[in-house]
Amino acid sequence: MKVLQEPTCVSDYMSISTCEWKMNGPTNCSTELRLLYQLVFLLSEAHTCIPENNGGAGCVCHLLMDDVVSADNYTLDLWAGQQLLWKGSFKPSEHVKPRAPGNLTVHTNVSDTLLLTWSNPYPPDNYLYNHLTYAVNIWSENDPADFRIYNVTYLEPSLRIAASTLKSGISYRARVRAWAQCYNTTWSEWSPSTKWHNSYREPFEQH
């Protein structure tokens, strides 16, 4: 049994880091493998993660962490029984993938303005809470070419757009994702999408 693709890990900079790797053949990850992880610090504790299957030869492990600070560094040991398959380290602050925003809502009752709001996925006491910016994706269910991205570079989790910038009388969907420049994070996963019917009053034209 060998590791084909070494573990790569990302942290949500809150309580979970996710590590993925591939074995050289079909593997029952949860029964055959264990990923041990330990904070490199005085009197730290070794923890064991039981991986799950992620495709035939792929494994994924969710490492629980009580808290994350920028100096944290973890040792990682991948074991198959008594055999050490791989040894590495992981610094969560250097591999951050934020949590996905939630509760995306489209408010259509504001005079020909669409107000999209969502929730910041972090509690106020988390460092990332005040450092997230967002991308909102809006697309038409009828027209695949009608696909747009709005970058929200301010901290407020909301976006206002004129309803008239979208076509009237058709359904749209929206989703949102987040990233934090301070830690040069990757983008989060997209939030679940929300759907609405876009309709607005055409301006009265005088002839």
Epitope: Q38, L39, F41, L42, L43, S44, E45, D66, D67, V69, S70, A71
Partner: antibody, heavy 119, light 107 residues
């Protein structure tokens, strides 16, 4: 809410030993470290050392090696510190303080145990 | 050992004031700087850990900042219950060491 309950005040004679206790109201004692801190008017706060109750690992301030011995009883969520060969310099308030395992900040503190060394 | 210096041993301020308490380390401590509050009855509580992280249950009027060797604790809107002695502590290098404390009183 985590609470640490320390044993009561001690009046001991020079040359004797004293053993104080600290009981933690936590679910999994092994996920924490128990540290001990000395406070005197002259020296202020001094870190004595810490213990991982799960595996028994200890770390001591060199100044207190040979003076303090840290132990724990996992079954009762209780940590102990024994001080030996006591002198008047050991008269102080001693605090137990809990950290999450491998952390450098004392998240919860006991109320303190006053030790008075006097003939 | 790393020396932690709190140059102000005591200070007096009025209710509602913004108060800043400083702490200097004798060498770089890489943000491993924590702040504690000791009430007159001896009760000790963690306020801020790792320079600027607010411990759970601590009012948001407390904040911390700094880097390298210089750190500070700020109380933005002083209340009567903040009367206490405040200690800094470094957790970067063994042995972990504390500052001498700053006693805060109300004018």
């Amino acid at each position: 809410q985590v609470q640490l309950q320390e044993s009561g005040a001690e009046l001991v004679k020079p040359g004797a030993s004293v053993k104080m206790s600290c009981k933690a109201s936590v679910n999994t004692f092994t996920g924490y470290n128990m540290h001990w801190v000395k406070q005197t008017p002259g020296q202020g706060l001094e870190w004595i050392g810490g213990l991982h109750p799960g595996n028994g690992d200890t770390s001591y301030n060199q100044k207190f090696k040979g003076k303090a011995t840290l132990t724990a009883d996992k079954s009762s969520n209780t940590a102990y510190m024994q001080l030996s060969s006591l002198t008047s310099e050991d008269s102080a308030v001693y605090y137990c303080a809990l950290t999450t395992a491998g952390r450098a900040w004392f998240a919860y503190w006991g109320q303190g145990t006053l030790v008075t060394v006097s003939a | 050992d790393i020396q932690m210096t709190q140059t102000t041993s005591s200070l007096s301020a009025s209710l509602g004031d913004r108060v800043t308490i400083s702490c200097r380390a004798s060498q770089d401590i890489s943000n491993y700087l924590n702040w504690y509050q000791q009430k007159p009855d001896g009760t000790v509580k963690l306020l801020i850990y790792y320079t600027s992280r607010l411990h759970s249950g601590v009012p948001s009027r407390f904040s911390g900042s700094g880097s390298g060797t210089d750190y500070s604790l700020t109380i933005s809107n002083l209340e009567q219950e903040d009367v206490a002695t405040y200690f800094c502590q470094q957790g970067n290098t063994l042995p972990w060491t504390f500052g001498g404390g700053t006693k805060l009183e109300i004018k």
